[in-house]
């Protein structure tokens, strides 16, 4: 008779999700030697631990202080690029910008990137069909607690200027509800943090309007001056040309806006 | 600007004690949790202590756990460690670090322990 099994209202597992983490894990330790010191298979046991044989509506930040210990790691903390709806461009800015983090440029962020996992309560297996949608199931859920857990400590973590890269094509511009807005944006510390500084993203080749006035971006402002940080905001007209000048600064039209 | 001081290192033992201590500027020192974390030669940085902005929550790496003990004194801005039964593998530089990690920018010098016969 097949057991029974609780369905999810969101995917299941990546496949292979295992030897994904301890792959990823090996590959981050050869690349970054700083790093290289690292039991990979201790990472894996204590990533696993977080959530195999729990209830995955259950999960709290609590359940992955094992694997937080492990994935202890040195962050300038005056070189962190926060991120809302806009990965991709973000991503390829650190791949330029050495010396700058995004969260997935650390060791926690690079293993759990695009990955859905969770297990199922009193059975030590991986479930492969179904896991817990954030709005639809619940919140607790170990992925969305994951990315809360490793975003506020991230946020937490950051000094002097941040910046955060938002993507000028969505309609709201900043989220309330995306993980910078809810999280993020609350974790940085004031005491620690002097300025905000906000990227605008621009989509279309011909947009001129200075998006850094648009009514969710006043919002942001609003939030980060009410907790005694300072922000300025950026607008980049042409993302191209952007990445283009931080691999080739002295180039002659990286002068102009960008 | 966050500014910390650590002192108390030195070469002791096996088996003997050392007491770490950190002197914090900078920011309101009761607000933030604070974490030790070391640097063994030749190796990456590892967690090992972290305790709440009270005082009244700790955690230790599972290395450290029944030996070391962190506290702080939040009147004199200072977060200690005290260590026991040193033994040759704590041998490392230990820097304090405000938050609990797992990521990290220590801002002192670090205070070098030697753990040796």
């Known amino acids: 008779v097949p057991r029974w099994r609780q369905q999810w209202s969101g995917p299941g597992t990546t496949k292979r999700f295992p030897e994904t983490v301890l792959a990823r894990c090996v590959k981050y330790t050869e690349i970054h030697p700083e790093m290289r010191h690292v039991d990979c298979q201790s990472v894996w046991d204590a990533f696993k631990g977080a959530f195999i044989s729990k209830h995955p509506c259950n999960i709290t930040e609590e359940d992955y202080q094992p694997l937080m210990k492990l994935g202890t790691q040195t962050v300038p903390c005056n070189k962190i690029l926060l991120w809302s709806r806009i990965k991709d461009l973000a991503h390829q800015f650190t791949q330029v910008q050495r010396d700058m983090f995004t969260l997935e440029d650390t060791l926690l962020g690079y293993l759990a990137d695009d990955l859905t996992w969770c297990g199922e309560f009193n059975t030590s297996k991986i479930n492969y069909q179904s896991c817990p949608d954030w709005r639809k199931d619940c919140s607790n859920n170990p992925v969305s607690v994951f990315w809360k857990t490793v975003s506020r400590r991230f946020a937490e973590a950051a000094c002097d200027v941040v910046h955060v890269m938002l993507n000028g094509s969505r309609s709201k511009i900043f989220d309330k509800n995306s993980t910078f807005g809810s999280v993020e944006v609350h974790n940085l510390q004031p005491e620690k943090v002097q300025t905000l500084e906000a990227w605008v993203i621009h989509g279309g080749r011909e947009d001129s309007r200075d998006l850094c006035q648009d009514p969710t971006i006043k919002e942001l402002e609003s939030i980060i001056s009410k907790r005694n940080i300072q922000f300025s905001c950026k607008n980049i007209y042409r993302p191209d040309k952007f990445l283009q000048c931080v691999k080739n600064p002295e180039d002659s039209s990286c002068t102009s806006e960008i | 600007e966050v500014q910390v001081l650590e002192s108390g290192g030195g070469l002791v033992q096996p088996g003997e004690s050392l007491r770490l201590s950190c002197a914090v500027s900078?920011?309101?020192?009761?607000?933030?949790?604070m974490s030790w974390v070391r640097q063994a030669p030749g190796k990456g940085l590892e967690w090992v202590s972290g305790?709440?902005?009270?005082?009244?929550?700790?955690d230790y790496a599972d290395s450290v756990k029944g030996r070391f003990t962190i506290s702080r004194d939040n009147s004199k801005n200072t977060l200690y460690l005290q260590m026991n039964s040193l033994r040759a593998e704590d041998t490392a530089v230990y820097y304090c670090?405000?938050?609990?990690?797992?990521?990290?920018?220590?801002r002192g010098q670090g205070t070098l322990v030697t753990v040796s016969s």
């Open positions: 670090a405000d938050g609990t990690g797992p990521f990290f920018d220590y």
């Open positions: 900078g920011f309101t020192f009761s607000n933030f949790a």
């Open positions: 305790i709440s902005g009270s005082g009244g929550s700790t």
